[in-house]
């Protein structure tokens, strides 16, 4: 796995434990919580990331809260089970056995139930509407600039393929961006983009996961580009099963 | 211009299910927010939910478990459905447009199609 | 029972000036700058007048104005119009990501 070679630290995730004990004294970088090595020239999954943020000291985990508004986040931060690539393991459950099925990005797909809960594959969020609104600027970003300047982040900062990026539509103030990325087209090393989307939530929150770099400051022409209000959606290759008695919390 | 209109049976039984289609004329259904809203006789408004063209859905929680809405772009329409209704869901329906697509605040709205659940 | 409160009527004579209020929490109106503000006539579907506390859509006169101070949004009409009798209803986004609506006001022009 490559790392900054010169102080063995990993530039795309600051939560992890470097030491120069790779083969060949490579540096070799793992993830706080899991132990498992990353490879530092991409995005780390976002299971062992929330893995990380929850092996945490506590006093640390409360400054980073969970999206307030997201519908990701209902049932707030948990320690996830990951499989050995890194992905979120379909069933998981908590320390008192109440378990439940998740899709590809952790989030909850079932009504929870105990140890005999069966998820049989864990399923694909392919459809991923990141909804931006931006505070009051004197005028209205020109759609074409705020378009391009956004592909290229998710291309150069997410290292996420255009091809995943399907739209962007902007009426001010509302900015939403598209993202699509069915099995069939994720190729072997294509940044997933559930984990495009974490890193770029955490970035609007001021939290970001990038080792050493400046936050992100996200601007058109110049222009910074604040914004207010963060939304985001996620839809599964196969619907959720949750039944009619669904929690309403 | 863009036009919504509502519709759908206008008497149903206690138990049946509700089903409602808003057609969007006069504009895409694209990326836009595309409410429910309802009005009980002689009562305020209550929010419904919402579908987003790409298909992904957000409903009043009061409701959930009971509601689901779609979206056919290729017919520009966003159909409802209700289930196990009783008089409670007796009510006028409306669907209206996302302004600037946000999802709280309406600007377009069709006429509103009244049901009526009873035995 | 709504989530948002709003007197059930208020009146004012031609040429006066109304405010009618909406009263929520910080987990809605005053905890984001999302409030609309609809006027409807009997028979009739809801026209946006306010959107995003005090904006006015394209159309609406100028006679419409929003405010917000606290968890209270306003909404104020000057120089009342015989043709503004209507009901008003209030909406605000929710810390929930759900939308609530006040129980409405009947306005008559005396």
């Known amino acids: 796995h490559t790392a900054a070679q010169d102080n063995c630290t990993c530039p795309t995730n600051k939560m992890t434990v470097c030491s120069p004990d790779g083969p060949g004294g490579r540096c070799q970088c793992r993830a706080l919580g899991s132990g498992m090595a990353v490879d530092c020239s991409t995005l780390t999954s976002k299971c062992l990331l929330l893995k990380a943020r929850m092996s945490a000291p506590k006093n640390a985990r409360t400054l980073v809260r969970p999206s307030e508004h997201a519908l990701v986040d209902n049932d707030g931060l948990y320690d996830p089970d990951c499989d050995p690539e890194g992905r979120f393991k379909a069933r998981q459950c908590n320390q008192t056995s109440v378990c439940w099925c998740v899709n590809s990005v952790g989030v909850r797909r079932t009504d929870k139930g105990d140890l005999s809960l069966r998820c049989d594959e864990l399923v694909r969020t392919h459809h991923i509407l990141i909804d931006l609104r931006h505070r009051p600027t004197a005028g209205a970003f020109n759609h074409s600039d705020l378009d391009a300047e956004l592909r290229r982040l998710f291309r150069e900062r997410y290292r996420l393929h255009p091809k995943f990026v399907a739209a962007v539509h902007y009426e001010q103030p509302t900015i939403q961006i598209e993202l699509r990325q069915n099995t069939s087209q994720k190729a072997a090393g294509d940044v997933d983009i559930g984990d495009a989307a974490y890193y770029f939530e955490r970035d609007i929150k001021g939290e970001s996961l990038f080792q050493g770099r400046g936050g992100l400051d996200l601007r058109v022409r110049g222009e910074p580009l604040q914004v207010e209000r963060t939304l985001i959606y996620y839809l599964d290759e196969i619907p959720p099963k949750f039944s009619m008695k669904r929690l309403t919390a | 211009q863009l036009q919504l209109q509502e519709s759908g049976p206008g008497l149903l039984k206690p138990s049946e299910t509700l089903s409602l289609i808003c057609t969007v004329s006069g504009g895409s259904i694209s990326s836009h927010y595309w409410s429910w809203i309802r009005q009980t006789p002689g009562k305020g408004l209550e929010w419904i939910g919402w579908i987003h063209s790409s298909g992904i859905t957000n409903y009043n929680p009061s409701l959930m478990g009971r509601v689901t809405m779609s979206v056919d772009t290729s017919k520009n329409q966003f159909p409802l459905k209700v289930n196990s209704v009783t008089a409670a869901d007796t009510a006028v329906y409306y669907c209206?447009?996302?302004?600037?697509?946000?999802?709280?605040?309406?600007?377009?709205w069709g006429q509103g199609t009244m049901v009526t659940v009873s035995s | 029972q709504s989530a948002l409160t709003q007197p059930a009527s208020v009146s004012g004579s031609p040429g006066q000036s109304i405010t009618i209020s909406c009263t929520g929490t910080?987990?809605?109106?005053?905890?984001?700058?999302?409030v609309s503000w609809y006027q409807q006539h009997p028979g009739k579907a809801p026209k946006l007048m306010i959107h995003?506390?005090?904006n006015r859509p394209s159309g609406v006169s100028n006679r419409f104005f929003g405010s917000k101070s606290g968890n209270t949004a306003s909404l104020t009409i000057s120089g009342l119009q015989a043709e503004d009798e209507a009901d008003y209803y209030c909406?605000?986004?929710?810390?929930?990501?759900?939308?609530?609506f006040g129980g409405g006001t009947k306005l008559t022009v005396l």
């Open positions: 995003d506390v005090s």
């Open positions: 209206a447009r996302g302004l600037r697509l946000t999802d709280d605040a309406f600007d377009i």
């Open positions: 910080s987990s809605d109106v005053g905890g984001y700058n999302y």
């Open positions: 909406s605000s986004y929710t810390s929930s990501n759900t939308l609530a």
